[in-house]
């Protein structure tokens, strides 16, 4: 469900929301760290709709979400598991 | 205008089955999903069931999926409850809602219900 | 099944006064709260969602607030409109479970 991608393409997010989504209408979740032309870092939320929504990294549900799924992770794998994007 | 009308409500034996429909209009039906929420007399709320807008997902309440099937017509732009071996306890109004799954992601439009009266 | 236990269950308040329903949820649901108002023999209608966010055309003196297992619902300025039943509800997952109600009544 998380995905870490480090791009050099400038920032993909103009809009942010802070609004919490159920975790059954997620498809996945892409982080994009800071750095590489864009100066903040920047989270992805792929909808089961097909639609995109950009969350604000700052945002409570988003933070306690990835808190769950990081103890979740850990628990299973070794370590983390990070996808990397060619750009 | 968002429009749910609920119909297929009525007196009933138990034991009996019921066919509920909700017709929605000014809204693109095919990309929401759609719940069924249900109130006994005097009580809460109480959520039956949803359906995703391919019918692909589907969840109940774990003590009504036995005897409750929620389906769908996109084509139609209606929503159906079938609910079978009714009981006195299923006695309530049920309301059809939509499930913003965009921008709100619970229920944000509701109908204004149909009664369902179970008894001998 | 996720518990919602709302209280009070009735509440009688005078007009201006500021208006306090609380929701203890039986486990964490993130913000994944929502506050309905209903009239009777009418439908609910959504006031708030994801625990503190007003829906379109609520006015302001209804807000939200909390996270995880506590949630609070306000009204700061009671008006004679307001008298109705609130319900709340959480949407992290299915089962989707409401709260018990509370009644508001004027003095």
């Known amino acids: 469900v998380l995905e870490v991608y480090y791009t050099s393409l400038r920032c993909r997010c103009v809009q942010e929301s802070s609004v919490f989504i159920p975790r059954r209408f997620i498809d996945r979740i892409q982080i994009l760290p800071r750095g590489n032309g864009c100066p903040r870092k920047e989270i992805i939320v792929w909808k089961k709709n097909k639609s995109i929504v950009c969350v604000d990294p700052q945002a409570e549900w988003i933070q306690r979400m990835m808190e769950v799924l990081r103890k979740r992770s850990s628990s299973t794998l070794p370590v983390p598991v990070f996808k990397r994007k060619i750009p | 205008e968002v429009q749910l009308v609920e119909s297929g409500g009525g007196l009933v034996q138990p034991g009996g089955s019921l066919r509920l429909s909700c017709a929605a209009s000014?809204?693109?039906?095919?990309?929401?999903?759609m719940s069924w929420v249900r109130q006994a007399p005097g009580k809460g709320l109480e959520w039956v069931a949803e359906i995703n807008p391919e019918s692909s997902t589907i969840n109940y309440a774990p003590s009504l999926k036995d005897r409750f099937t929620i389906s769908r017509d996109n084509a139609k732009n209606s929503l159906y409850l079938q609910m079978n071996s009714l009981r006195a306890e299923d006695t309530a109004v049920y309301y059809c809602?939509?499930?913003?799954?965009?921008?709100?992601?619970?229920?944000?439009?509701w109908g204004q219900g149909t009664t369902v009266t179970v008894s001998s | 099944d996720i518990q919602m236990t709302q209280s009070p269950s009735s509440l009688s308040a005078s007009v201006g006064d500021r208006v306090t329903i609380t929701c203890k949820v039986s486990?964490?649901?993130?913000?994944?709260v929502a506050w309905y108002q209903q009239k009777p023999g009418k439908a609910p209608k959504l006031l708030i969602y994801?625990?503190?966010y007003r829906y379109t055309g609520v006015p302001s003196r209804f807000s939200g607030s909390g996270s995880g297992t506590d949630f609070t619902f306000t009204i700061s300025s009671l008006q004679p409109e307001d008298i109705a039943t609130y319900y709340c509800q959480q949407y992290y997952s299915t089962p989707l479970t409401f709260g018990g109600g509370t009644k508001l009544e004027i003095k």
């Open positions: 809602a939509r499930q913003d799954d965009y921008e709100h992601y619970t229920m944000d439009y």
């Open positions: 486990q964490d649901v993130n913000t994944g």
């Open positions: 994801s625990a503190s």
């Open positions: 000014g809204i693109d039906f095919s990309r929401y999903w």
